[in-house]
């Protein structure tokens, strides 16, 4: 789980060990702050749980791509 040491900086210290079904992911944000020990992605699920994931893992990249496509406004 993400940990806010001194708000507003949120850091991840551990990553999830298991892939999360992409259909259960609602949104994500990248953690790139130099105040954090590692770069991370925090996914928010449809039931509002927040999960730290490793941005180097393919499933994390695929999930971000999927969410990006979902949120793109259709061109008219």
């Amino acid at each position: 789980q993400p940990d806010a040491i001194n708000a507003p900086v949120t850091c991840c210290y551990n990553f999830t060990n298991r892939k999360i079904s992409v259909q259960r992911l609602a949104s994500y944000r990248r953690i790139t702050s130099s105040k954090c020990p590692k770069e991370a992605v925090i996914f928010k699920t449809i039931v509002a749980k927040e999960i730290c994931a490793d941005p180097k893992q393919k499933w994390v990249q695929d999930s971000m791509d999927h969410l990006d496509k979902q949120t793109q406004t259709p061109k008219t």
Epitope: T16, N17, R18, K19, I20, S21, V22, Q23, R24, A26, T45, I46, V47, K49, I51, W59, D62, Q70
Partner: antibody, heavy 119, light 113 residues
């Protein structure tokens, strides 16, 4: 394509334990979330528990919490469900079921393992 | 926990006739931002594991005949078999995968009249 193959039928005495296995092929176990569902004779489907990646832990139905243990051997891609303190009402077919990365629902089921509890 | 209640418990329908099964959820299983209902329908024939028919409440699994259709949203869902065939004799279950614990309806047995 994921395939799940379960261990064979078991007959147990009341008070004993049973351990059912579920071997995964076509994917590695760590890519999946394994769940267990049982069905007593002539009854409906009952979710017993499974791995919840959102909590990064195995969660159990309240009804089975104190009697069931679900484990995994990632070296052999095999999941296990152990049920202890068996009673006659535990006579049922036990299924493993899983979903892959692109689905949140159980799209793959094992063939089922009949566990009979009888003195 | 989300409770799913199916109706009827059993149903006898003539060959070629329509069969309709309802599933009511105690809480909404709709995730409104993507308009997806986290509900599936399974068919279970005697001695076999459940077979996935419908996911996202209305999307047919590949290979499932088009006489099977799912509809509904939020808390009320329906599985329809438009023209019952002999091989459709089975028990049908709805299941939600919106929030844990995952729960099933009690099942609806479909027979030929």
């Amino acid at each position: 394509q994921v395939q799940l193959v379960q261990s064979g039928a078991e007959v147990k005495k009341p008070g004993a334990s049973v351990k059912v296995s579920c071997k995964v092929s076509g994917h590695t176990l760590t890519e999946l979330s394994m769940h267990w569902v049982r069905q007593a004779p002539g009854k409906g489907l009952e979710w017993m528990g499974g791995f919840d990646p959102e909590d990064d832990e195995t969660i159990y139905a309240q009804k089975f919490q104190d009697r069931v243990t679900m484990t995994e051997d990632t070296s052999t891609d095999t999941a296990y469900m152990e049920l202890s303190s068996l009673r006659s009402e535990d006579t049922a077919v036990y299924y493993c079921a899983t979903n892959d990365f692109w689905s949140g629902y159980f799209d793959c089921w094992g063939q089922g393992t009949l566990v009979t509890v009888s003195s | 926990d989300i409770v799913l209640t199916q109706s009827p418990d059993s149903l006898a329908v003539c060959l070629g006739e329509r069969a309709t099964i309802n599933c009511k959820s105690s809480q909404s299983v709709l995730y409104s931002p993507n308009n997806k209902n986290f509900l599936v329908w399974y068919q279970q024939r005697p001695g076999q594991p459940p077979k996935l028919l419908i996911y996202w409440a209305s999307t047919r699994e590949s290979g499932v005949p088009d006489r099977f259709s799912g509809s509904g949203s939020g808390t009320d869902f329906t599985l329809t078999i438009s023209s019952l065939q002999a091989e459709d004799v089975a028990v049908y279950y709805c299941q939600q995968y919106y929030s844990s614990p995952w729960t099933f309806g009690q099942g609806t047995k479909v027979e030929i009249k």
